[in-house]
């Protein structure tokens, strides 16, 4: 089941998955001036068996101006530097989730890959939050969020993290202000409204990926 919701937004924090559950998709996105090769994969898919998980399919980009396909090579240093600018200021290693069964590691870059990586998470995926540079964490619990299925709808658990500016006066534990609900964020951890939604069960996803779903979303 794909997670049909946005992970929680924590002010002054970013998040990252340390590893990706089987079923996760990563779009094959190319940087400006490049496009996917005509016969190329639309996405990479984390698949596996009981002992090993890996990314199926390979992403390949070619210049928008030519018809030549490009080979998969390690990006040039400036390309690696460009990608690194999106990463967090200090490493986060709460757990070596990549060694867990049923998880894939971060896939290696491909030539002319876009600087943005677009993942489609599945139920059970965990992401870890960290305050951005210049802010420090006030923890009330785990700084992580998990995509869960509740009453037939997916939702992300709320990470217990507040990021405060270094110069701000910190509050004593237990006196932290409750996290404001972001605009538009449904706030319901326990209640279950029985309503008709446009959420569609997305079974046998991998089998149908290459067909009609890429113009309309999982019809």
């Amino acid at each position: 089941e794909l997670c049909d919701d946005d992970p929680p937004e924590i002010p002054h924090a970013t998040f990252k998955a340390m590893a990706y559950k089987e079923g996760t998709m990563l779009n094959c996105e190319c940087k400006r001036g490049f496009r996917r090769i005509k016969s190329g994969s639309l996405y990479m898919l984390c698949t596996g068996n009981s002992s090993h998980s890996s990314w199926d399919n390979q992403c390949q980009c070619t210049s928008s101006a030519t018809r030549n396909t490009t080979k998969q090579v390690t990006p040039q240093p400036e390309e690696q530097k460009e990608r690194k600018t999106t990463e967090m200021q200090s490493p986060m290693q709460p757990v070596d989730q990549a060694s867990l069964p049923g998880h894939c590691r971060e896939p290696p870059p491909w030539e002319n890959e876009a600087t943005e990586r677009i993942y489609h998470f599945v139920v059970g995926q965990m992401v870890y939050y960290q305050c951005v540079q210049g802010y420090r964490a006030l923890h009330r619990g785990p700084a992580e969020s998990v995509c869960k299925m509740t009453h037939g709808k997916t939702r992300w658990t709320q990470p217990q993290l507040i990021c405060t500016g270094e110069m701000e006066t910190s509050q004593f534990p237990g006196e932290e202000k409750p996290q404001a609900s972001p605009e538009g964020r449904p706030e319901s951890e326990t209640s279950c409204l029985v309503t008709t939604t446009d959420f569609q069960i997305q079974t046998e996803m991998a089998a149908t990926m290459e067909t009609s779903i890429f113009t309309t979303e999982y019809q």
């Epitope: 946005d6 400006r32 972001p182 890429f214």
Partner: nanobody, 130 residues
Framework: QVQLVESGGGSVQAGGSLRLSCEAS?????????MGWFRQAPGKEREFVGA????????SYADPVKDRFTISRDNAKSTVYLQMNNTKPEDTAVYYC??????????????????????WGQGTQVTVSS
């Protein structure tokens, strides 16, 4: 990789309503992208109107349109909407739909600067007369 086509523009009296639509096509998942609306009046810079995150959880609006405009999306139809209520003459502009992606494995859920948007539609004219 993503083509965006706006529709629903036209003329409306001040105080009236208009609903703009933006349909995406291309071999990609619509829910890959956050979506935004921008507008450009004659002789002015293109300005942010509002945006919505991948699954519609988060929205953000420019101050001049807050409480009047509403953005929504239907991922099953690969379409994002801009509902314009209580329109004013200063809302007259060409309205553009745009798509943005997220950086790395991290999410800045709603983006407000036009430089952060990767794909753009051709625009649709909205004229509000007094």
């Amino acid at each position: 990789q993503v083509q965006l086509v706006e529709s629903g523009g036209g003329s409306v009296q001040a105080g009236g309503s208009l609903r703009l639509s933006c349909e995406a096509s291309g071999r990609t998942l619509f829910s890959s992208y956050g979506m935004g609306w921008f507008r450009q009046a004659p002789g002015k810079e293109r300005e942010f109107v509002g945006a919505i995150s991948r699954f519609g959880t988060y929205t953000s609006y420019a101050d001049p349109v807050k409480d009047r405009f509403t953005i929504s999306r239907d991922n099953a139809k690969s379409t994002v909407y801009l509902q314009m209520n209580n329109t004013k003459p200063e809302d007259t502009a060409v309205y553009y739909c745009a798509a943005y992606t997220y950086s790395g494995s991290f999410y800045s859920t709603v983006k407000t600067h036009h430089d952060e948007y990767r794909y753009w539609g051709q625009g649709t004219q909205v004229t509000v007369s007094s």
